[in-house]
């Protein structure tokens, strides 16, 4: 008796929806790349299910994913990053569903970090700066960033600004005086590589100065 599903189990398995999605992160740990996959249906019974990637790999034919709760992942240097790989959901030796995917088209950048906002009194503006690990990378270097900010009391009224640099200037007159703002930033590949938005950076909070009555300008913080 083998350790994988018996025939009855396979028949049941074939009735299930094994749709899955994946994203890659290149040079996420030194020169290591990662690939993360998960089932789209959170109710899929994943007990005996494994993921495997074959093709477009360096030196090896296939690699198995490791499982961490509901997430399947690989960390490796062995992605060729040219051509399509075949990613399969398997139970024992049987493939239940497969997808041909070019790992360069499902790239999810790392989240930006060190977001900060500095008020310039003389210029009456706020300089927003942040950092990204992708500046040091060999592959995914060119990103589009999405800076989103809102007045803290306005739950869903986010203003978005797209930029390719890591510096943005917000004019004081475009913001409400004496108000608390929340700001955050995320990134997406913008040249050759394609994929998904990164996670949001941690939010940064800043307060706008009050209007100075004599000059009609805001007071510095």
């Amino acid at each position: 008796e083998s350790g994988y599903a018996q025939n009855g189990d396979l028949e049941d398995a074939e009735l299930d929806d094994y749709s899955f999605s994946c994203y890659s992160q290149l040079e996420v740990n030194g020169s290591q790349h990662s690939l993360t996959c998960a089932f789209e249906d959170p109710d899929v019974n994943i007990t005996n299910l494994e993921f495997e990637i074959c093709g477009a790999l360096v030196e090896v034919k296939c690699l198995n994913f490791r499982k961490l709760q509901e997430i399947y992942f690989i960390e490796t240097k062995k992605f060729l990053l040219i051509g399509k790989s075949n990613i399969c959901v398997k139970v024992g030796e049987k493939s239940l569903t497969c997808k041909k995917i070019d790992l360069t088209t499902i790239v999810k950048p790392e989240a930006p970090f060190d977001l900060s906002v500095v008020y310039r009194e003389g210029a009456n503006d706020f300089v927003v700066t942040f950092n990204t690990s992708h500046l040091q990378k060999k592959y995914v270097k060119v990103l589009m960033h999405d800076v989103a900010y809102r007045q803290e009391k306005d739950e869903n009224k986010w203003t978005h600004v797209n930029l390719s640099s890591t510096k943005l200037t917000l004019l004081q007159r475009k913001l409400q005086p004496a108000a608390m703002y929340e700001i955050k930033v995320r990134s997406i590949p913008d040249h050759y590589f394609k994929g998904f938005w990164s996670e949001w950076s941690p939010s940064y909070y800043f307060r706008t100065p009050e209007i100075n009555n004599s000059s009609g300008e805001m007071d510095p913080i």
């Epitope: 030194g30 494994e50 495997e52 198995n64 490791r66 499982k67 490796t76 062995k78 024992g92 030796e93």
Partner: antibody, heavy 119, light 107 residues
């Protein structure tokens, strides 16, 4: 072709330190893979001891953590095993091997070097 | 640590017969299992990886099956050179651990 070759003293006295060398040819140890030490006791039981990753990071089996060190010399394409405070229980054949981490196998092994711990 | 229980410890068989060795993991290890052959005085040689995949250059009479916690290794038609020792090994989590081995003897 990838080849691994162990070398060492053959005989070590109890409480002393053991040093073994694995010389790799045909593949750079800084390119990829984990580079492992495995030993086989006289009764044929195999024990994985630890590895040094191509990046230089190391992982050891918990039972040896306090007395094991795996290092490397990238200019000579060698990696090393040091085992401190040896006892007669450390008498074994010591192998170096490539693999593990992102692949589920050791694909290349050295021929092994026999170590006896005796006074 | 994950315990790998391999059975039988030894088995007698005749040329041309089939034999099956089993390996039980103390917890689920997916397909992170390899099988090795070891000839006397030599280092272990990879036969099967990812539980079911045949390593390069290994004859097709060797096969592996299973996933999760129960794994099997089969030699379908024993040749004289197959009467040696076999080991399973898990790579699911460190410390990577081996089974106790199976010695095949000629009947």
């Amino acid at each position: 072709d990838v080849q691994l070759q162990e070398s060492g003293p053959g005989l070590v006295k109890p409480s002393q330190s053991l040093s073994l060398t694995c010389t790799v040819t045909g593949y750079s140890i800084t390119t990829d893979y984990a580079w492992n030490w495995i030993r086989q006791f006289p009764g044929n039981k195999l024990e994985w001891m630890g590895y040094i990753f191509y990046s230089g990071s190391t992982t050891y089996t918990p039972s040896l953590k306090s007395r094991i060190s795996i290092t490397r010399d990238t200019s000579k394409n060698q990696f090393f095993l040091q085992l401190n405070s040896v006892t007669t229980e450390d008498t074994a054949t010591y192998y170096c091997a490539r693999g593990g981490y992102d692949v589920n196998y050791f694909d290349y092994w050295g021929q092994g070097t026999t170590l006896t711990v005796s006074s | 640590d994950i315990q790998m229980t391999q059975s039988p410890a030894s088995q007698s068989a005749s040329l041309g017969e089939s034999v099956t060795i089993t390996c039980l993991a103390s917890q689920t290890i997916g397909a992170w299992l390899a099988w090795y052959q070891q000839k006397p005085g030599k280092s272990p040689q990879l036969l099967i990886y990812a539980a079911t995949r045949l390593a390069d250059g290994v004859p097709s009479r060797f096969s592996g099956s299973g996933s999760g916690t129960k794994f099997s290794f089969k030699i379908s038609s024993l040749q004289a050179e197959d009467f040696v020792s076999y080991y399973c090994q898990q790579f699911f989590s460190t410390p990577w651990t081996f089974g106790g081995g199976t010695k095949l003897e000629i009947k």
